[in-house]
C-alpha cells in the first residue's frame, strides 16, 4: 500500500506566441482546481479507460479576477498535494491524466459552472520510494509544471511497496536471509506473516495473511499432498478434502469490488466496473457529486434525481460513458463514402477522398471525363472515381492510343485460327464448327445449330466478326 502524490507548481501560458486569454474576468471571477487520474501500465487508452489505480481532486484555488489589459499570468493554485492512495503493489509503470478545471463564480443559475481548461496525459516509469520527479506538459497554449512521486505507507517498503519492514531486534544485524530496509538502515526487512499455520515447507505468501501452496500440495494451510489418481480433471489449485485438483478461486471470487461494482477477470488480476458515483481500483472512492467535477473532457455535469444517479454527465460530441471518459470511435460508423479515408480529429471528422470524389463525406462523384480525351475514336466512360475509355476496334490501352492485337486473347473457339483484320478479327473455324468465334458445332447431318448460314457462306468457311 502507498500513496501517489502530485504537486502542481504552476499553470499558465506556455512560451511562444499566441498567449491564451485569461480564463477569469472582473465580470466572471473564477478559481482553478485539478483532477488526476491514474491507470497501471503504459496504456495508450489512459484517457478513455477507468482510473483503475485511483483518482483525486484538488481543493479549489484562490478566487482570481483578471486585471484589465494584463496578459494571463500563472494562475493562483490550490494549496496542498493531490494524493491518490493505492492499496496494492505500486505497478512501476503508470499512465496519468491531469485536468485543469475552471469554476466560474458569477451569478450562475443553479450554482457554479465548471469547464475544462486543459488536459495533459502521459506514460511514465516510477519506482516507489524514489525522489520527486519533475515534469512539464503543454496543452494548447497552456503549460502545466508539476512534480510527482510514489511513496509506500509503513510498514511497506521497496520499489513496489510489497516488502514489509520492522524495527531491528538485534542492534548489529538483521535475521538470517533478511536485508536491511534501505534507506531505513535501522530497520530490517520483515518476513511476510502468512496465514497462521501455513506450512513453512509447502506454503508461501505474497501478501500478509495468505497461504499459497507449492505444486503438489493443497489445503488451506498447504499440508495436504495432492493425489491426482482419483481425480477426473486435474486443473488447478487443489481441494483440501479430496486432494484432487479442482478449479481454484478466481480473482473475482467474493467480488472485491465495493459499492456495487462488478468484477471482471483480467489476465493478471481483476478489474472493477464501478457504478456512477464511485471509482478507484475497487470502487472504494465515493460520494462524488457535481461539486467534484466528475465529468471528463468538458462534459456538463447536472445533479441526478436519485442516489444511483447522483450526477449526470452530458458529454460533448466525440465522448461517451458515465463520466464522458470514453472517446467515441466515430470512424467505426464508416461515414466516408466511396472508399474515403476517415480521420477523427477530436473536434471534427474529416474524410480524405479518393480521386474522383469530393464533399465532406466524399459523397460527390466528380465528372471523371471532364477534360479527358480518348484517342482514335474511343469514348470516355465515367465510373468508380476514374475515367475509362471504351476503345474503337483495333485500339486499346487507357487512352486508346495503343494499336490492339485482336487475336491476343485467342478469341476463336474449338481450335479456330484468328486473323487480324482492319475492322476487327476473323476466325477460320476448324471442321465441324461455325460462328463468328467458331462457338457453334455443326450437326452431323449437316444442319447447323443455328439458322441457315447467311447466303454465300458455307459452314466451315472463315466468318468475319462484324
Amino acid at each position: 500500500a502507498g500513496v501517489f502524490e502530485l504537486q502542481i507548481h504552476s499553470f499558465g501560458p506556455g512560451p511562444g506566441p499566441g498567449a491564451p486569454r485569461s480564463p477569469c474576468s472582473a465580470r466572471l471571477p473564477c478559481r482553478l482546481f485539478f483532477r488526476v487520474c491514474l491507470k497501471p501500465g503504459l496504456s495508450e487508452e489512459a484517457a478513455e479507460s477507468p482510473c483503475a489505480l485511483g483518482a483525486a481532486l484538488s481543493a479549489r484555488g484562490p478566487v482570481y479576477t483578471e486585471q484589465p489589459g494584463a496578459p494571463a499570468p500563472d494562475l493562483p493554485l490550490p494549496d496542498g498535494l493531490l494524493q491518490v492512495p493505492f492499496r496494492d503493489a505500486w505497478p512501476g509503470t503508470f499512465s496519468f491524466i491531469i485536468e485543469t478545471w475552471r469554476e466560474e463564480l458569477g451569478d450562475q443559475i443553479g450554482g457554479p459552472a465548471w469547464s475544462l481548461l486543459a488536459r495533459v496525459a502521459g506514460r511514465r516509469r516510477l519506482a516507489a520510494g524514489g525522489p520527486w520527479a519533475r515534469d512539464i506538459q503543454r496543452a494548447g497554449a497552456w503549460e502545466l509544471r508539476f512534480s510527482y512521486r510514489a511513496r509506500c505507507e509503513p510498514p511497506a517498503v521497496g520499489t513496489a511497496c510489497t516488502r514489509l519492514c520492522r524495527p531491528r531486534s538485534a542492534p548489529s544485524r538483521c535475521g538470517p536471509g533478511l536485508r536491511p530496509c534501505a534507506p531505513l538502515e535501522d530497520e530490517c526487512e520483515a518476513p511476510l506473516v502468512c496465514r497462521a499455520g501455513c506450512s513453512p515447507e509447502h506454503g508461501f505468501c505474497e501478501q500478509p495473511g495468505e497461504c499459497r501452496c507449492l505444486e503438489g500440495w493443497t489445503g488451506p494451510l498447504c499440508t495436504v499432498p495432492v493425489s491426482t489418481s482419483s481425480c477426473l480433471s486435474p486443473r488447478g489449485p487443489s481441494s483440501a478434502t479430496t486432494g484432487c485438483l479442482v478449479p481454484g478461486p478466481g480473482p473475482c471470487d467474493g467480488n472485491p469490488c465495493a459499492n456495487g461494482g462488478s468484477c471482471s477477470e483480467t489476465p493478471r488480476s481483476f478489474e472493477c466496473t464501478c457504478p456512477r458515483g464511485f471509482y478507484g481500483l475497487r470502487c472504494e472512492v465515493s460520494g462524488v457529486t457535481c461539486a467534484d467535477g466528475p465529468c471528463f473532457n468538458g462534459g456538463l455535469c447536472v445533479g441526478g434525481a436519485d442516489p444511483d444517479s447522483a450526477y449526470i454527465c452530458h458529454c460533448p460530441p466525440g465522448f461517451q460513458g458515465s463520466n464522458c471518459e470514453k472517446r467515441v470511435d466515430r470512424c467505426s460508423l464508416q461515414p466516408c463514402r466511396n472508399g474515403g479515408l476517415c480521420l477523427d480529429l477530436g473536434h471534427a471528422l474529416r474524410c480524405r477522398c479518393r480521386a474522383g470524389f469530393a464533399g465532406p463525406r466524399c459523397e460527390h462523384d466528380l465528372d471523371d471525363c471532364a477534360g479527358r480525351a480518348c484517342a482514335n475514336g474511343g469514348t470516355c466512360v465515367e465510373g468508380g472515381g476514374a475515367h475509362r475509355c471504351s476503345c474503337a476496334l483495333g485500339f486499346g490501352g487507357r487512352d486508346c492510343r495503343e494499336r490492339a492485337d485482336p487475336c491476343a486473347a485467342r478469341p476463336c473457339a474449338h481450335g479456330g485460327r484468328c486473323y487480324a483484320h482492319f475492322s476487327g478479327l476473323v476466325c477460320a473455324c476448324a471442321p465441324g464448327y461455325m460462328g463468328a468465334r467458331c462457338e457453334f458445332p455443326v450437326h452431323p447431318d449437316g444442319a447447323s445449330a443455328l439458322p441457315a448460314a447467311p447466303p454465300g457462306l458455307r459452314p466451315g468457311d472463315p466468318q468475319r466478326y462484324l
Epitope: G260, S262, V302, G303, A305, D306, P307, D308, Y311, I312
Partner: antibody, heavy 117, light 109 residues
Framework: EVQLVETGGGLVQPKGSLKLSCAVS????????MNWVRQAPGKGLEWVAR??????????YYADSVKDRFTISRDDSQSMLYLQMNNLKIEDTAMYYC????????WGQGTLVTVSA | QAVVTQESALTTSPGETVTLTCRSS?????????ANWIQEKPDHLFTGLIG???NRAPGVPARFSGSLIGDKAALTITGAQTEDEAIYFC?????????FGGGTKLTVL
Amino acid sequence: EVQLVETGGGLVQPKGSLKLSCAVSAFTFTTYAMNWVRQAPGKGLEWVARIRNKSNNYATYYADSVKDRFTISRDDSQSMLYLQMNNLKIEDTAMYYCVFYYDHVYWGQGTLVTVSA
Amino acid sequence: QAVVTQESALTTSPGETVTLTCRSSTGAVTTSNYANWIQEKPDHLFTGLIGGTNNRAPGVPARFSGSLIGDKAALTITGAQTEDEAIYFCGLWYSNHLVFGGGTKLTVL
C-alpha cells in the same frame, strides 16, 4: 422518448394476489434503478418499492406498509419491471405507477388496482 | 421514518412569483436528498419538473426552478400562469427510500 407502460391491474379480493408489469423503452434499462409508486384515491403519492441495477446486485427496498407482502423484480433482457403483490389489503387500492429517476422523474400512465370484497 | 411536509395550499395571481417549500423532519434538506418536484394535473397526469434539487427537466418552462432555501427544498414559479394550477409534490431520498410530501394545491386566480 422514454416510455413506461404498466399493465396487470384489476379487481382482486382481500388476501388475493396480483402481478403488475411495466414495459420500458427508449433508454438503457439495465443501467438504472427502478421504482413503484402508488396513489390511493383522493390521496397523495406513496413510494412502494425500489430495485437497483445488476452492478448493485439488484438490491431491493420496500416501504414499511408493503414489506413482506410485495416483491419487486426486473428482467433486464426484456426491459421489464414487475411487482408481485400478495396478501392484498383494502388499503392497497390505488393507481400504481412505474417510476424511473434519472435527471428528473419519469412516469408511466399507471394501472389501477382495486382490492374489494 | 422521515416525514416530509409541504404547504397544503397556496394561491397566487398570474404573473406573480410563488415559492413552494419542502421540509424534512430529520433536519435540513441537502443535495444528498436529491429533491424532486412533480406536478399532478387532473386525470392522474404526472410530470417530473425538477430532479436533483435544481435540475429542470427537458421541456419544462424556465419559470420553474428548484433550489435549497435555508433548511428546505423550494420550487419557485417566476411569473405564474393559469395553466400552472395543479398539485405539486416534492420527494426526498433518504438513502434508498423515497418519501413524498403531502402535496401543495396551487391555485392561480
